[in-house]
């Protein structure tokens, strides 16, 4: 006997109680493919999650994070607390970036400033907790007689500019 369930479209399930008739997925459930014998329970966007898109008969709900949090993982499986720029999230909460590191986003970790000298360049703008250093011309370009449209800033070690 041919399996009649294969004829059931997405959004339905094959109801064995009704001689393999395709029944619509009940509210708060879905089936994203045809031929299913059960419908999956819809995801609930509660707590730190908010609804981006409702659950339909053929697709699961899509969640986002409430203000002050951001998504992590596939399909926003977790919400992580935002921090300010110049901070990173630790087990003890949001902490300022250590000297010599920066974070220009509300998420992620503090990263070391660029070492301009590794590229043979000098520091044009100092780094801060929120911003990386800006590298300028190489020291060789600063030698007398070198043509430059604007006078370069003197080379110095990266450091915090006044906050």
């Amino acid at each position: 006997l041919q399996d009649l369930c294969s004829n059931c479209p997405a959004g339905t399930f094959c109801d064995n109680n009704r001689s393999q008739i395709c029944s619509p997925c009940p509210p708060n459930s879905f089936s994203s493919a045809g031929g299913q014998r059960t419908c999956d329970i819809c995801r609930q966007c509660k707590g730190v999650f908010k609804t981006r898109k409702e659950c339909s008969s053929t697709s699961n709900a899509e969640c986002d994070c409430i203000s002050g949090y951001h998504c992590l993982g596939a399909e926003c499986s977790m919400c992580e607390q935002d921090c300010k720029q110049g901070q990173e999230l630790t087990k003890k909460g949001c902490k300022d970036c250590c000297f010599g590191t920066f974070n220009d986003q509300k998420r992620g970790i503090c990263r070391p400033w660029t070492n301009c000298s590794l590229d043979g360049k000098s520091v044009l703008v100092n780094g801060t907790k929120e911003r990386d250093v800006v590298c300028g011309p190489s020291p060789a370009d600063l030698s007398p007689g070198a043509s430059s449209a604007t006078p370069p800033a003197p080379a110095r070690e990266p450091g915090h500019s006044p906050q």
Partner: antibody, heavy 115, light 112 residues
């Protein structure tokens, strides 16, 4: 639990208009809040909704000219570049069971666009 | 766009008869279909959603079936109070946050 629309009136073509939906007995932020319209003697037209996550969705013809927003107790429908074709009764409704199916409807408010 | 074609446009039946109204979607919408009843001068009333789920307070004389592109509303044991226009409506999400939550053209139920 109830829903009621207000702000419908006679306007001239091109005039912007904002309709307000006031609810009682439930929290707006927990539901899809939907706008639907019906021209005199015609069928129903779905405009769009704002969901419980504060996201807005619009039908293709409404996108750009209609804007749905909400406060804690009201839902607004802002309409721009109105023409005679926008003459209709505008309904506000609450979605049923976490969906964008209009379940609880207001009585509607009539907007007439005429010069 | 998703086009919802409703048939018939009008139906005339005696009291206690059974009325069947059909709704066809231009593409598969799973089971994302609702039925509404509207009487003159009143807002629509939700009867059925998710193709077959009866809304709160709706008599069991109303039933919905179908999936994919073909859907049916059945009103059995017709009463005078059922004289109204009936609409189907789909839920369908497109891209770029555009929705195709289209209503059918309506079916008027009158009595012989």
């Amino acid at each position: 639990q109830s829903v009621e629309e207000s702000g419908g009136r006679l306007v001239t073509p091109g005039t912007p208009l904002t309709l307000t939906c006031t609810v009682s007995g439930f929290t707006i932020s927990s539901h899809h809040m939907i706008w639907v319209r019906q021209a005199p003697g015609e069928g129903l037209q779905y405009i769009g909704f704002i969901n419980d996550g504060d996201y807005t969705y619009y039908t293709n013809w409404a996108k750009g000219r209609f804007t749905i927003s909400r406060t804690s107790t009201t839902v607004d429908l802002k309409m721009t570049s109105l023409t005679a074709a926008d003459t209709a009764t505008y309904f506000c409704a609450r979605g049923v069971d976490g969906t964008s199916y209009p379940g609880l409807w207001g009585p509607g408010t009539l907007v007439t666009v005429s010069s | 766009d998703v086009v919802m074609t409703q048939t018939p446009a009008s139906v005339s039946e005696p009291v206690r008869a059974t009325v069947t109204i059909k709704c066809q979607a231009s593409q598969s919408i799973g089971a994302d279909l609702a039925w509404y009843q509207q009487k003159p001068g009143q807002p629509p009333k939700l009867l059925i959603y998710r193709a077959s789920t009866l809304a709160s307070g709706v008599p069991s004389r109303f039933s919905g079936s179908g999936s994919g592109t073909e859907f049916t509303l059945t009103i059995s044991d017709l009463e005078c109070a059922d004289a109204a226009t009936y609409y189907c409506q789909c839920i369908y999400y497109g891209t770029d946050d555009v929705i195709y939550h289209t209503f059918g053209g309506g079916t008027e139920v009158v009595f012989k």
